[in-house]
Amino acid sequence: KKEDGESTAPTPRPKVLRCKCHHHCPEDSVNNICSTDGYCFTMIEEDDSGLPVVTSGCLGLEGSDFQCRDTPIPHQRRSIECCTERNECNKDLHPTLPPLKNRDFVDGPIHHR
């Protein structure tokens, strides 16, 4: 049973899926198109300087159900959306960064003397 607030990955297709790729194109991609047995994705995350970076591409079927669930990671602002309903469907995905929590400002790395 799906828990409230948990998004599951879309249904896999019975055939190869073409996806737009950006910053995440495999070596076999042509014209920024990759192919997969799994999902297309678009992801937004903060880089080291706190700027939002959008990447998109292909996720293989194996393990992608977990990756597409977008489980929150402490101290990492990141959001991913996945799709399979049509080729290049990730062109229309627009994930947004989760809001900053107050403690994100104050919680720094813990240093032990």
Partner: antibody
């Protein structure tokens, strides 16, 4: 059983256009890609392009992008390829072929296109 | 575009002999994410359309006799017919489906002595 039915032959005049057909049966048409392949005597096989019938998404071999246009009619499970500005170089056998994962598991019998006045 | 080169262009064998034909690609067809080689072999008998024999370099298509054996990895591939039969008279083509445009080798014509 899976079948891809193509007309046996077409004869057209130079400069004209032709629309080749490929009627699919024995499987769910939208669950597979359809490809078109050209074969000239002694010149092997050339991939022209592909179409996904479910969303009509196409990819073309750059060599054929100004020559061929791929379409489908989902209601009749038929794929089409239109060829324009025909010359003797376009005389060949044209096959439609089905794929799920980019290798071609079923082929039509081919249409022999002759361009001649 | 990936160039596929087949050799020999033709060969004549007697029934019962072992046949090997080669297919070389201008770049590797091995995908690192799944360690599969994106190469297929087809048989085309005179006056007929091509028929799939082998995909992913070594997986025999359902219904294909087990005398047809695909092998190889990276850029060098082989189709072996362990004991050739009269009905194997045909042209044999390899095809890469690693990167578009999908390309075919020039073919090997098998004649029966």
């Amino acid at each position: 059983q899976v079948q891809l039915q193509q007309p046996g032959a077409e004869l057209v005049m130079p400069g004209a256009s032709v629309k080749l057909s490929c009627k699919a049966s024995g499987y769910t048409f939208t669950n597979y890609w359809m490809h078109w392949v050209k074969q000239r005597p002694g010149q092997g096989l050339e991939w022209i392009g592909e179409i996904d019938p479910s969303d009509v998404y196409t990819t073309y071999n750059q060599k054929f992008k100004d020559k061929a246009t791929l379409t489908v009619d989902k209601s009749s499970s038929t794929a089409y390829m239109q060829l324009i500005n025909l010359t003797s170089e376009d005389s060949a056998v044209y096959y439609c072929a089905r794929s799920g994962w980019d290798y071609f598991d079923y082929w039509g019998q081919g249409t022999a296109l002759t361009v001649s006045s | 575009d990936i160039v596929m080169t087949q050799s020999p262009s033709s060969l004549a064998m007697s029934v019962g002999q072992k046949v090997t034909m080669s297919c070389k690609s201008s770049q590797s067809l091995l995908k690192s994410n799944n360690q599969k080689n994106y190469l297929a072999w087809y048989q085309q008998k005179p006056g007929q359309s091509p028929k799939l024999l082998v995909y992913f370099a070594s997986t025999r298509e359902s219904g294909v006799p087990d005398r047809f054996i695909g092998s190889g990895s990276g850029t060098d591939f082989t189709l072996t017919i362990s004991s050739v039969q009269a009905e194997d008279l045909a042209d044999y083509f390899c095809q890469q489906y690693y990167s578009t445009p999908w390309t075919f080798g020039g073919g090997t014509k098998l004649e029966i002595k």
